[in-house]
């Protein structure tokens, strides 16, 4: 078991707030056994670690919103793996089950007197953690203790399912959505014929499976549907990109409904088989506009179109993050690691286990170089708020006229907090209102991206377009330079006057051969075509046909020409 | 579905020389093309290959000395300043798909000879 | 890179032997595997792609195998017009073309 796991980030409060973070990238699937996390992430760790922090800072520091009641918080690493997250969940729960034995006077001492011990105060709620499949597994326990989850980017569709997850909301729209805006690009463009690539796991198969249905009834066509793990090794990328190609160049644009290092991997794939420029990928919401996704591998993502979840970058936490310094930041317990893994330095006095970098950091290092916010921060501040504003509610509704915690909410009762919570609704850090429907589900507001070459050896993410309730705006000059450059992706052209569709047994709906009627035929429909009736004959547009007008011999009109069959 | 190369000839040192693969039967929009020489006593070496988008990929050693470039029924290889080293019997070959896989078919060969 | 190393560089063997040709990868080409047979004076001639698949009028007395690194072409019940130079090539990567095809091997049956 790596000790990396056991740290917790603590904060004191009246009432504890769980959150499972992915401080740490997912173990290595040779490590996976052993439940040992890869290296240190910023945006989705780190960064979020400290949103959690200060956000609760500034929530305990406004008079208005929980007055007299400290919230604090016990934030957990997820690993973005499933079985850590749900080791963490269990630490959560256990805290839980002895705070309250302990309340009903169950804890007793092993001579039977009383205990005077008293053990951490329970979790009433947990934030995250950020994948489905990961969200999903945890929610099967905290349901159990009737213990509510906000996601902040956990979208999968089969979240929304209440009967299954009845403690389960979300500050971000399910899947559902992004898959019909995927489908809505792709019929922009008039991309008939496309490759489906997902990441293995829920948000990647049921994300692709509502964008199949969605596809299917707009008459597009997949080439191919292929699957792979974030976490699979170079061999597997590389198997899938040979596959990818044997669709060329019908199939030139792969819809990934894929996490940001299934992207990754891919781009990497390309790089080692020499396929840049070969395909369009069209991203879902995992890769957006992540930086750590194509860092390295620019050329190979140019001219990704991507989904972004609409959320804007959030000022007054960059003005709290960029001061932070490793000698003064102590409450986060990942922060020395990560200062020396973001600046390939060493710090004096941290203890190293293997001392992977030789060159001490310097004091004028900071997180200003090349900073860039985690593009879900909104999402998850606003999480964060919820449950606030939920217990807020709930303290209200359950102590009126009283400041502070009565004893109605001695024990936090999860399912009234969980009632409470449905019914919140506030204006979110990024000014739009954030409410929850039946299903705990948030509405859906999305972002274009086109990930483009700017200048030379210059790249970047720029915003082309909009997805809202269902109505798709795109800027597709910026997209496209010019008309001609936009990206075929057809299995077969339309045929020509005359000429119907042929589809091979066993082929898709959109791969033909055209075949020209017979002399004596028009074109009944685009499969069939159709014999002209005696005394009939094909118009000029092969549409239909036209009687021939019956000409009768006069006399005096010159014999018809005729050859015998003695003629030689 | 076929390929010919055709341009070998006797040239000297310096001069350049543009090989030519024609194709019948098939869509170079479709398939990718490889050129593959075979230096006498040696075994058989890529120099490049030109991808049905267009792009083209070459053997470290033949970057800048070698260009491959398409029409829609031909594909060209211009050897820039050829050596004695580049005597040689050049093969034009389809893939077997869009981009880089293996070649079949392919052409009979043209003998490129450098020589002062 | 992916360079290729193809033993042996030669090989005799009676008609109605069987001749065995290795060719190892420097890292792994997942399968994407070809093997060509040359005669003098013709263009090579595809045998076998994705390590075992069969070029269509090839004899099934030619066999691919082998995964990961490590491929072999097994050419059984020989006959006088296999006498000819052997070639494995990696299908894998086209930005890496330097040595893709093996060093050949030169079957002469006896």
């Known amino acids: 078991q790596s000790s990396e796991r056991r740290v917790v980030a603590h904060m004191p409060g009246d009432i504890i707030i769980g959150a499972l973070f992915s401080v740490h990238h997912q173990p290595t699937v040779d490590k996976v056994h052993e439940r040992k996390c890869g290296a240190v992430r910023e945006q989705y760790g780190i960064q979020r670690v400290e949103a959690m922090l200060h956000t609760l800072e500034r929530i305990n520091s406004d008079p208005t919103l929980l007055p007299n009641i400290t919230l604090g918080c016990e934030i957990r690493d997820s690993c973005w793996h499933s079985a850590v997250a749900l080791e963490q969940s269990i630490e959560f729960i256990r805290d839980s089950l002895i705070s309250s034995e302990e309340e009903e006077g169950l804890v007793r001492c092993v001579d039977g007197s009383s205990s005077s011990f008293r053990s951490k105060k329970p979790i009433v709620g947990v934030i995250g953690p950020g994948s489905s499949s990961v969200a999903i597994q945890v929610q099967n326990l905290l349901q159990l203790f009737n213990i509510p989850q906000i996601a902040y980017s956990a979208t999968s569709m089969d979240l929304s399912d209440k009967t299954l997850f009845k403690y389960f909301m979300r500050v971000v729209p399910s899947d559902a959505q992004q898959a019909r805006a995927m489908v809505d690009i792709v019929k922009r463009y008039n991309w008939t014929y496309v490759s489906a690539v997902h990441t293995e796991g829920n948000y990647g198969e049921s994300g692709m499976e509502a964008f199949k249905d969605m596809s299917a009834k707009e008459g597009i066509c997949i080439a191919h549907s292929y699957k792979i793990y974030s976490n699979a090794g170079e061999q597997s990328f590389d198997k899938l990109l040979k596959k990818l190609t044997s669709h060329l160049p019908k199939a030139r644009v792969v819809a990934c409904f894929c996490e940001g290092m299934t992207v990754r991997g891919l781009l990497m794939a390309m790089r080692r088989l020499g396929l840049a420029g070969e395909f369009l990928l069209l991203g879902s919401d995992g890769w957006a506009d992540r930086y750590d996704v194509t860092d390295g591998y620019q050329r190979e993502a140019v001219g990704g179109i991507t989904i972004k979840l609409q959320s804007p970058d959030v000022k007054w936490f960059d003005d709290y993050y960029l001061k932070l310094r490793p000698e003064t930041n102590h409450r986060n317990p990942w922060f020395q690691e990560f200062w020396q893994h973001r600046f390939q330095c060493r710090l004096e006095g941290f203890p190293q286990e293997n001392s992977k970098y030789n060159k001490t950091c310097d004091s004028s290092l900071t997180l200003k170089t090349h900073h860039v916010q985690d593009s879900k921060m909104g999402f998850v501040i606003n999480a964060i708020y919820s449950m606030a504003y939920g217990l807020h509610n709930m303290q209200m509704s359950l102590c009126p006229g009283y400041a502070g915690l009565c004893d109605a909410m001695k024990p936090i009762d999860g399912r009234k907090l969980l009632e409470s919570l449905m019914k919140t609704n506030f204006t979110g850090v990024s000014g739009d209102m954030i409410l929850f429907d039946e299903n705990g589900d948030s509405p859906g507001r999305y972002e274009i991206m086109n990930f483009k070459e700017m200048g030379k050896d210059y790249f970047d993410y720029i915003n082309v377009g909009s997805w809202d309730n269902g109505e798709l705006k795109m800027d597709d000059d910026e997209v496209w330079s010019k008309k001609s450059n936009i990206i075929r992706s057809v299995c077969s052209e339309p045929c020509e006057k005359g000429q119907i569709k042929v589809i091979r047994k066993g082929e898709v709906s959109c791969c033909w051969t055209c075949t020209p009627c017979k002399e004596n035929e028009y074109v009944f429909d685009e499969y069939t075509c159709k014999a002209c009736q005696l005394g009939s004959w094909p118009t000029d547009d092969l549409t239909g046909c036209d009687l021939i007008p019956v000409q009768y011999l006069r006399w005096g009109d010159p014999e018809p020409d005729y050859k015998d069959d003695d003629d030689k | 579905q076929s390929v010919e190369e055709s341009g070998g000839r006797l040239v000297t040192p310096g001069t350049p020389l543009t090989l030519t693969c024609t194709v019948s039967?098939?869509?170079?929009?479709?398939?990718?093309m490889g050129w593959v020489r075979h230096v006498p006593g040696k075994g058989l070496e890529w120099i490049g290959i030109?991808?049905?988008?267009?792009s083209t990929y070459y053997a470290s050693w033949a970057k800048g000395r070698f260009t491959i470039s398409k029409t829609s029924t031909t594909v060209d290889l211009k050897i820039t300043s050829p050596t004695t080293e580049d005597t040689a019997t050049y093969f034009c070959?389809?893939?077997?798909?869009?981009?880089?896989?293996?070649?079949?078919?392919w052409g009979p060969g043209t003998l490129v000879t450098v020589s002062s | 890179a992916y360079d290729m190393t193809q033993t042996p560089a030669s090989v005799s063997e009676p008609v109605g032997g069987t001749v065995t040709i290795k060719c190892q990868a420097s890292?792994?080409?997942?399968?994407?595997l070809s093997w060509y047979q040359q005669k003098p004076g013709q263009p090579p001639k595809l045998l076998i792609y994705?390590?075992?698949t069969l070029a269509s009028g090839v004899s099934s007395r030619f066999k691919g195998s082998g995964s990961g690194t490590e491929y072999t072409l097994t050419i059984s019940d020989l006959e006088c017009d296999d006498a000819a130079a052997y070639y494995c090539?990696?299908?894998?990567?086209?930005?890496?073309?330097?040595?893709?095809f093996g060093g050949g091997t030169e079957v002469v049956v006896k």
């Open positions: 030109i991808y049905a988008s267009g």
């Open positions: 070959a389809r893939s077997r798909t869009a981009t880089y896989d293996a070649v079949d078919p």
């Open positions: 039967g098939f869509s170079l929009s479709r398939y990718a």
């Open positions: 994705e390590a075992s």
């Open positions: 890292q792994s080409i997942s399968s994407y």
């Open positions: 090539q990696q299908d894998l990567s086209g930005s890496n073309l330097d040595n893709s």
